[in-house]
Interface confidence: low
């Protein structure tokens, strides 16, 4: 990622998207190393700290304000040249978030998808945003940007993600920007986890004492596999949330998690998936569906002693 012969490469760590009040490190990489460099901002709202300043290796900028949003370039020190400085680097856009209220982010057809499928992430708001930005957690490259479309008092943009591969799984957030301030972004949307399934062999799902139980009888669903999954995820058809448990190695060399559902009040179709700690958003193929039937006096809900995970917590590690 080096620049051209006489062109430094300017980058930002951890990301070009910086929350208001946060910090960002700007690094100017020039001629096989970090040298003295100067930074400048390509607009009229000059951040005063740059005037006549020379930096070494990297410059930590912050706490950032909306005035820090914009395009930056650097020049590397080149003592024997006519000007003493290299050609300007690549432009680097720093976006500052937290300047407007957050938009909403939805996944169509849903956040749980098979490898190879495409998902549309729709970012929308009643704020008349001119542009929307989509950013994946942990990625330092610039977010994707789309022009907002306005309809019935709502501005929105549809981002197409796919065909889905493990590298695209993760936690997404979107932001909006208003006219005339393209790099002063809104607060982030609530995080949305995009999970890709179908990458590893399916686990097996069984019910104790069995798939048909009396109303009020305690039921446990066991998910197991020969694969050394770290986490199992249990989903019930028609429920937005999944439950997850750490896998436990068993004497028979399988890896298993037991989901206690409590006293049976209502049946349903269940599936489970396995995943590894290193890639929490990449799941196995689904187990065969398991239909749990309740005889006697079914009611409309099933208590869950294991708290369902939030829709945005799937891609975090289980501690």
């Amino acid at each position: 990622l080096m620049g051209g012969q006489d062109k430094p490469f300017l980058s930002a760590r951890p990301s070009t998207v910086v929350p208001r009040g946060g910090h960002v490190a700007l690094q100017c990489h020039y001629r096989r190393g970090f040298n003295n460099f100067m930074l400048y901002k390509e607009d009229r709202s000059h951040v005063p700290i740059f005037h006549g300043r020379i930096f070494q290796e990297s410059f930590i900028m912050g706490p950032v304000t909306p005035a820090h949003a914009g395009t930056y370039r650097c020049r590397g020190s080149r003592p024997h040249s006519l000007t003493g400085w290299s050609a300007p680097s690549n432009p680097l856009v720093i976006m500052v978030t937290g300047n407007h209220r957050k938009p909403s982010l939805l996944a169509h057809p849903g956040p749980l998808l098979k490898s190879g499928e495409t998902v549309i992430l729709q970012c929308w708001s009643d704020v008349m945003f001119e542009h929307f930005f989509l950013h994946r957690e942990g990625i330092s490259e610039d977010p994707s940007r789309l022009v907002g479309q306005i309809h019935d008092g709502v501005s929105k943009a549809n981002f197409s993600i796919g065909p889905l591969m493990p590298v695209l799984a993760g936690t997404y957030r979107c932001y909006g920007s208003v006219p005339h301030s393209p790099y002063q972004l809104s607060a982030p949307s609530d995080p949305l986890d995009i999970v890709i399934t179908g990458l590893y062999e399916k686990p097996s799902l069984s019910a104790q004492p069995g798939p048909t139980v009396q109303a009020g009888e305690n039921v446990t669903l066991s998910c197991s596999s020969w694969s050394s999954y770290d986490i199992y995820h249990l989903s019930r058809e028609g429920e937005a949330h999944e439950r997850r448990l750490r896998a436990v190695p068993k004497v028979n060399r399988t890896f298993q998690a037991d989901f206690p559902l409590g006293p049976a009040t209502h049946g349903g179709t269940y599936r489970c998936f396995g995943s590894f700690r290193a890639l929490p958003c990449v799941w196995s193929n689904s187990s065969d569906p398991l239909l749990v039937s309740v005889t006697g006096n079914p009611s409309s809900s099933w208590p869950s002693p294991t708290e369902p995970s939030s829709k945005s917590g799937i891609c975090r590690h289980l501690h």
């Epitope: 549309i120 008349m128 001119e130 542009h131 610039d142 994707s144 940007r145 789309l146 022009v147 479309q149 306005i150 309809h151 019935d152 549809n158 197409s160 006219p179 393209p182």
Partner: antibody, heavy 120, light 107 residues
Framework: QVQLVQSGAEVKKPGASVKVSCKAS????????MHWVRQAPGQGLEWIGY????????ENNRKFKDKTTMTADTSTSTAYMELSSLRSEDTAVYYC?????????????WGQGTTVTVSS | DIQMTQSPSSLSASVGDRVTITCRAS??????LAWYQQKPGKAPKLLLY???NLADGVPSRFSGSGSGTDYTLTISSLQPEDFATYYC?????????FGQGTKLEIK
């Protein structure tokens, strides 16, 4: 069906102004941005700018910033582009185009074009 | 501003030929790209959007590919009505520049 119908050809003298219209039908005018594109004789396409009819917000290509003024009349679903201080190099076909919706939207509908000739 | 460089600028081919036109952006445009066909005296007509998606009513012999900075329009088997000028256009922030065009002529 969606239609964008533009005003007829114009012949103007250098220094004059001209106002080109683009009447939209078949969709909700305020729900889509309207863009203008220029094509000089024998040349390629150049994006001039756009107007958001619901807010009146406009954005111009810097090249045309002092040349064009874009407006919209929501009561008649008509977008306008006025070209001022005309010169011979402004001779071109001017198109209006609607920016679509959905996945990475393109210009999905175009007007038939309005020829503006600047000649003394 | 983002520059769009189309190649070739002109191309002679015969009915039935497979033809490829390329478009290179001066920076990553993340598939925010459309292709248009224009015939003399007519407005441009949308062929593909989002780099690879066929617009309504466009024959399947047209296809698009690419990502990042490099994109391609392919016509798998040229028909007489395909002889026209083709333009790419990016939507990665304003100004939405077009390629300079590729004129496809009958050999």
């Amino acid at each position: 069906q969606v239609q964008l119908v533009q005003s007829g050809a114009e012949v103007k003298k250098p220094g004059a102004s001209v106002k080109v219209s683009c009447k939209a039908s078949g969709y909700t005018f305020t729900s889509y941005t309207m863009h203008w594109v220029r094509q000089a004789p024998g040349q390629g396409l150049e994006w001039i700018g756009y107007i958001n009819p619901s807010s009146g917000y406009t954005e111009n290509n810097r090249k045309f910033k002092d040349k064009t003024t874009m407006t919209a009349d929501t009561s008649t679903s008509t977008a306008y582009m006025e070209l001022s201080s005309l010169r011979s190099e402004d001779t071109a076909v001017y198109y209006c185009a609607r920016l679509g919706k959905g996945l990475l939207p393109p210009f999905d509908y175009w007007g038939q074009g309005t020829t503006v000739t600047v000649s003394s | 501003d983002i520059q769009m460089t189309q190649s070739p600028s002109s191309l002679s081919a015969s009915v039935g030929d497979r033809v490829t036109i390329t478009c290179r952006a001066s920076e990553n445009i993340y598939s925010n790209l459309a292709w248009y066909q224009q015939k003399p005296g007519k407005a441009p007509k949308l062929l593909l959007y989002a780099a690879t998606n066929l617009a309504d009513g466009v024959p399947s012999r047209f296809s698009g590919s690419g990502s990042g900075t490099d994109y391609t329009l392919t016509i798998s088997s040229l028909q007489p009505e395909d002889f026209a000028t083709y333009y790419c256009q990016h939507f990665w922030g304003t100004p939405y520049t077009f390629g300079q065009g590729t004129k496809l002529e009958i050999k």
